[in-house]
Interface confidence: low
């Protein structure tokens, strides 16, 4: 690569978000970065609540568990954890609450053992489609990730770009089919209004999916059919009104599934009849006796399991000539 006449080490300190140049020399085995705590016995490095603005360059090669929480990282550039020699043992990386607003393509490249990644509580206005795949190839090398925790990564309304936040996250999950081995995906508290229909079909290894505390209104176009390993599906605290027959049949067909549906505004009218019948028979819904109606007003707080078909009526739709203004 070409570069300007001055070496990178002469970068001006007047730009605080500029990554400093780093030697390619491997760190000493017992070295611990400034502002961090290290335990070689536990293979753990903790750099917590230290207002770090970049990932320490001198991480010890033995690190297996790395906590970089409560910092001010702002940006994770490509190869943010690339080292010579590589951090070959790093398996769990927690970056939660570190004010990240941008994760660039290839940010987690050169981490061959990375199994668990937590980016929760960062306002990710710009999550590259290739953040996890590291490549824009249609099929990338498989990521080693097994758990991806992305709870509360939605940025404030005024920092969102003119594009779907759901779409941005899903693009990163699906790029290059790199996350085919993902077993746990947490996407709670992200204001999701919908779930793009293709996302679950392309994550066939999922065991645990957490979509709680979002704003999902419907699952009509979401297919669970391919998720034969799914063990838990968290849909609490959404805006679900009813689950329709197709969804009910798909959930019932999953051999190991437990579904959590508390605190949704169920609409108990004639469209709810199939769901009520299913709830009475199924064992897959945890705490099903706690599910209550939110609408219509006359049904509020009624327990779904206690309803019968006579309770579930729809007001007739009057022809225009009979409607009152």
């Amino acid at each position: 690569s070409s570069s300007p006449t001055s070496s990178a080490s002469s970068f001006s300190s007047s730009a605080p978000f500029l990554a400093s140049a780093v030697s390619a020399q491997p760190p000493l085995p017992d070295q611990c970065p400034a502002l961090c705590e290290c335990s070689e016995a536990a293979r753990t490095v903790k750099c917590v609540n230290r207002n770090l603005t970049e990932v320490p360059t001198d991480l010890p090669a033995y690190v297996r568990n790395l906590f970089l929480t409560g910092n001010q990282l702002a940006v994770l550039p490509a190869g943010a954890f690339a080292r010579r020699p590589p951090l070959a043992e790093l398996a769990a990386l927690n970056l939660s609450g570190s004010r990240l607003d941008e994760v660039r393509a290839g940010a987690f490249e050169h981490l061959p053992s990375l199994r668990q990644l937590d980016l929760s509580h960062n306002p990710l206005a710009d999550l590259s489609p290739f953040a996890f795949s590291g490549s824009n190839a249609s099929v990338s090398a498989p990521s080693p990730l097994v758990e991806l925790i992305l709870n509360h990564i939605v940025p404030p309304e005024d920092e969102r770009q003119n594009r779907s936040f759901e779409g941005m996250v899903v693009a990163a999950l699906l790029a290059g089919r790199a996350l085919q081995g993902l077993r746990r995906l947490e996407l709670a508290s992200n204001h999701f209004l919908y779930l793009p229909r293709d996302v679950l079909a392309q994550l066939p290894s999922l065991r645990h999916l957490d979509l709680s505390n979002n704003s999902l209104v419907s699952l009509t176009y979401v297919s669970f059919r391919n998720l034969t390993h799914l063990e838990s599906l968290h849909l609490e605290d959404n805006a679900l009104k009813v689950l329709h027959n197709g969804t009910l049949a798909e959930l019932q067909g999953l051999p190991h599934i437990r579904v959590f549906l508390d605190n949704n505004p169920w609409v108990c009218d004639c469209h709810m009849a199939d769901m009520v019948t299913w709830l009475k028979e199924t064992e897959v819904v945890q705490g099903k006796d706690r599910l209550t109606c939110a609408y219509p007003e006359k049904m509020r707080n009624r327990v779904l399991l206690e309803l019968n078909s006579a309770d579930l009526d729809c007001d007739p739709i009057l022809p225009p000539s009979l409607q009152t203004s």
Partner: nanobody, 120 residues
Framework: EVQLVESGGGLVQPGGSLRLSCAAS????????MSWYRQAPGKGLELVAS????????RYADSVKGRFTISRDNAKNTLYLQMNSLRAEDTAVYYC?????????????WGQGTLVTVSS
Amino acid sequence: EVQLVESGGGLVQPGGSLRLSCAASGFTFSSYAMSWYRQAPGKGLELVASITTAGGSTRYADSVKGRFTISRDNAKNTLYLQMNSLRAEDTAVYYCNAELGPRRLGMDYWGQGTLVTVSS
């Protein structure tokens, strides 16, 4: 082969404006954050401004805030720097930068630079 070609530099009077462009090729432009740096005579390299992949987030050095605006057109594979209210201290060679990987592994790429001279 990655190529970055800057244009738009020149001589301008204090208080004037210029618009720099950087045409990129050889990589998926829309997938990478881009930056403008500058190097004044006898000085070190200074980061002027950077922009995220979709252009939704920008950052500026304090010395140019409110005067310079970085933008990008992913359809045209082009990065821009609009420079207003130029001052003598803005005189420098301006470089376009694409950080495609960690700088320490030599995976950042630079244009050849374009000279901006602010003088009356």
